[in-house]
Interface confidence: low
């Protein structure tokens, strides 16, 4: 009812709760005394249908019949208008307008945990727009019953707050939900189930990780469970892996030995429980523990590499390099490497311990035989020592790889190709390709890089540590016993014309010609590698084209003679520099003016 | 075991904001879980944040999630505490501590084997 309608009343028929797609009749009457004050057939009655007028009347009453409602609550209002005056509420009515529930659908029964509560879910059907009461009702045995009601419109979940005890772990119960409202009543199907189906375990926790004596091959998972738990299973992974191992163990007591973990890897576990083979259902899995595995001493062998460089007659340079074992092979954080030289004749060792480098750099004497043995160590020990023998790498000229040739593949990457050598190519046990950033003064600091390929190889495709515009000195050597053979070639992997030309810096006058001498282009300028410098002159004052000399490119050479100037006349002389992709701008320009007699 | 030193606690400003290191000796630091954790005058150590080894995970107290940001840097066997928006309830020492312990419950004390001596940190309203 709406207000206190002191003035009349409006009845609904048949009902203020009708089914969809029924008819109402609203009636809206006034009491005695309560219309117009002067005259009683200038009472006009009028229906609202929420604030639109949908009938009216003259007299005391008012009928109307009322069709097509929508699913929902629609509010009707009757008012009174007098002559002159505003209109005046009398009374209204809400009509609800709804279906009857659905069966319930799909109930299904859970208890979390030993210690939990029998809570139920099911699915209610359409929306019944109504005022609907659920009733849940579940049986025991000894005819025990619990009725657990819920009058939320959206009801489709109840806990009776009971909990099932695994005495009797066979026993049967039965819960069965029934909805009910103005226009009807419907029950689910019934659900049986024992305590072994509907109680699911707590996931498990306290999960921690023990690994015997700091190793990763003694190492056990333990966690706590809920008293009856029979099952677990336990999924693990590295953390930057996607794929879980998954295990299952039975009777496992809350404790699991795990046998093939990897080292110095940190891991996520989970577990979860269960407490019958075949019955009920697994826990959520528990939450996850990240531990990183001990460190196991490494495993395999360095790649290592030299180059020997020439002193004096008695001492030369070897420089020693190695790659970094892979996170498998290093199993742990790599402390130090191990650095021995040993004389083979003598029996003189020396050993070092390199840490932050991979790369040492001793001078030894030019006589004897030496031996290199370098080995990486972890805190639990270190790996099997990789060993070389010392020797002149190129000098085996039959060895020497043939017609090398280097050529840009793509960004950043050079195709290295060549033939076998002349000698026996099937005495080849592998070759090493090596390369280096070509630097003018030799540089000895200048990273190397090498690969190794298979003596069947005859081509190699280097990558690592490539810049584009940058000139490298590459090297293939074929390795045969204690003997080696070896062939070089610049390359680069794109380049363009050099940025600037070379600059002259000395005009020296030698027995008729003359001696130009020159600053290399700064690496930076040079753009790729050169192939050939260019030295042009021409008559200082003379407009005739000038003259030019090409000189091939050869790291260590910067300067060179020309004999062809004439005496008493000055020259202009200016250089260029040229790489596979063009010549560049020109460098300074010298004037100069032979001396001496022409010959 | 590590020897541990806090630094870059002071006073500052409601709304302002620090940053504090733990430096670490000992080169097994990578290995360690690492946690703050902070004692008001009159109140019992709580637990702050906490990071494992490779800085993989972390945690947050509840009140600074947010605010707070836990960092480590293996290579110079340092951990950090980078603090925002710090309220005056953020008062306290601040202790650093190392576990070798592999669980969850970085949140408990007594999983850290090792402490730092901790620095002041007031904040002003």
């Known amino acids: 009812k709406i207000d206190a309608c002191k003035r009349g009343d409006v009845t609904v028929k048949p009902s203020h709760v009708i089914l969809l797609g029924s008819t109402v009749n609203i009636t809206c009457s006034l009491k005695p005394r309560q219309g117009c004050f002067h005259y009683s057939r200038r009472n006009k009655l009028i229906l609202y249908k929420f604030d639109r007028r949908i009938n009216f009347h003259h007299g005391h009453s008012l009928n109307s019949q009322v069709t097509g409602l929508p699913l929902g609550t629609t509010l009707f209002v009757c008012k009174l208008a007098c002559i002159n005056s505003d209109e005046i509420q009398i009374c209204g009515a809400e009509i609800f307008v709804g279906v009857a529930p659905e069966q319930p659908q799909n109930l299904s029964c859970i208890q979390k945990g030993e210690q939990g509560t029998v809570a139920c879910t099911w699915e209610r059907g359409r929306d019944t727009h109504l005022y609907t009461e659920y009733t849940l009702q579940l049986s025991g045995p000894k005819n025990l019953t619990w009725q657990k009601q819920c009058k939320d419109i959206y009801c489709d979940y109840l806990d009776f707050g009971i909990n099932l005890t695994p005495e009797s772990p066979e026993s049967n119960f039965t819960a069965k939900v029934t909805a009910v409202n103005s226009l009807g009543s419907s029950s689910s199907l019934p659900s049986t189930f024992t305590f072994l189906d509907i109680v699911r375990p707590l996931p498990p926790w306290d999960i921690r990780i023990k690994f015997q004596k700091a190793s990763v091959s003694r190492c056990t998972l333990y966690w706590r469970d809920e008293g009856l738990v029979l099952l677990n299973r336990l999924r693990y992974r590295p953390s930057n892996s996607r794929l879980w191992n998954m295990v299952n163990v039975t009777k496992a007591k809350g404790r699991h030995d795990l046998l093939d973990l990897k080292p110095f890897t940190e891991y996520e576990f989970q577990i979860s429980s269960k407490l019958h083979l075949y019955k009920g259902s697994w826990s959520d899995w528990s939450e996850s523990l990240r531990a990183q595995t001990p460190e196991e001493e490494p495993t395999g062998m360095l790649d290592v590499w030299y180059m020997k460089r020439h002193i004096d007659y008695s001492r030369q340079q070897i420089s020693l390099f190695w790659k970094n074992l892979s996170v498998s092979e290093a199993r742990g954080k790599i402390l130090h490497y191990q650095v021995t030289l040993q004389e083979l004749t003598g029996g003189k060792a020396m050993t070092q311990n390199i840490t932050g480098h991979t790369s040492w750099t001793t001078v030894i004497p030019r006589t004897g035989n030496w031996a290199v043995a370098v080995s990486a160590a972890n805190s639990k020990g270190s790996s099997l020592p990789t060993r070389i023998n010392i020797m002149n790498l190129c000098e085996a000229g039959l060895l020497a790889p043939r017609q090398v040739s280097a050529n840009s593949e793509g960004m950043d990457n050079i195709l290295v190709t060549w033939q076998p050598p002349r000698k026996d190519p099937s005495a080849v046990q592998e070759y090493v390709v090596e390369w280096r950033e070509l630097h003018p003064g030799g540089d000895t600091q200048v990273p190397l890089n090498w690969l190794r390929s298979r003596p069947y190889n005859v081509s190699a495709l280097i990558s690592e540590n490539i810049k584009s515009y940058i000139c490298y000195e590459i090297r293939v050597y074929a390795l045969s016993g204690d003997q080696g053979g070896c062939s070089s070639i610049l390359g680069n992997s794109k380049h363009k014309a050099p940025l600037s030309g070379p600059h002259i810096n000395a005009i020296t006058e030698e027995k008729g010609s003359i001696l130009i001498s020159w600053n290399s282009i700064p690496v930076q300028e040079q753009m790729g590698c050169l192939l050939h410098y260019r030295i042009y002159w021409k008559e200082r004052d003379s407009n005739s084209q000038p003259q030019l000399c090409e000189i091939p490119y050869r790291v260590s050479q910067n300067s060179h003679p020309i004999n062809s100037l004439q005496p008493r006349v000055t020259y202009v002389l200016w250089m260029t520099a040229l790489t596979a992709a063009g010549e560049s701008s020109h460098g300074n320009e010298r004037e100069f003016c032979l001396q001496g007699k022409a010959n | 075991q590590v020897q541990l030193v806090e630094s870059g606690g002071g006073l500052v400003q409601a709304g302002g904001s620090l940053r504090l290191s733990c430096a670490a000796s000992g080169r097994t630091f990578s290995s360690y879980a690492m946690g703050w954790f902070r004692q008001a005058p009159g109140k019992e150590r709580e637990f702050v944040s906490a990071?494992?080894?490779?800085?993989?995970?972390?945690y947050y107290v509840e009140s600074v999630e947010g605010r707070f940001t836990i960092s480590r840097d293996n290579a110079k066997n340092t951990v950090y505490l980078q603090m925002n928006s710090l309220k005056p309830e953020d008062t306290a020492v601040y202790y650093c501590a190392a576990s070798r312990i592999y669980t969850n419950y970085v949140a408990r004390s007594y999983e850290y084997d090792d402490w730092g001596q901790g620095t002041q940190v007031t904040v002003s309203s």
């Open positions: 990071i494992s080894w490779n800085g993989g995970s972390r």
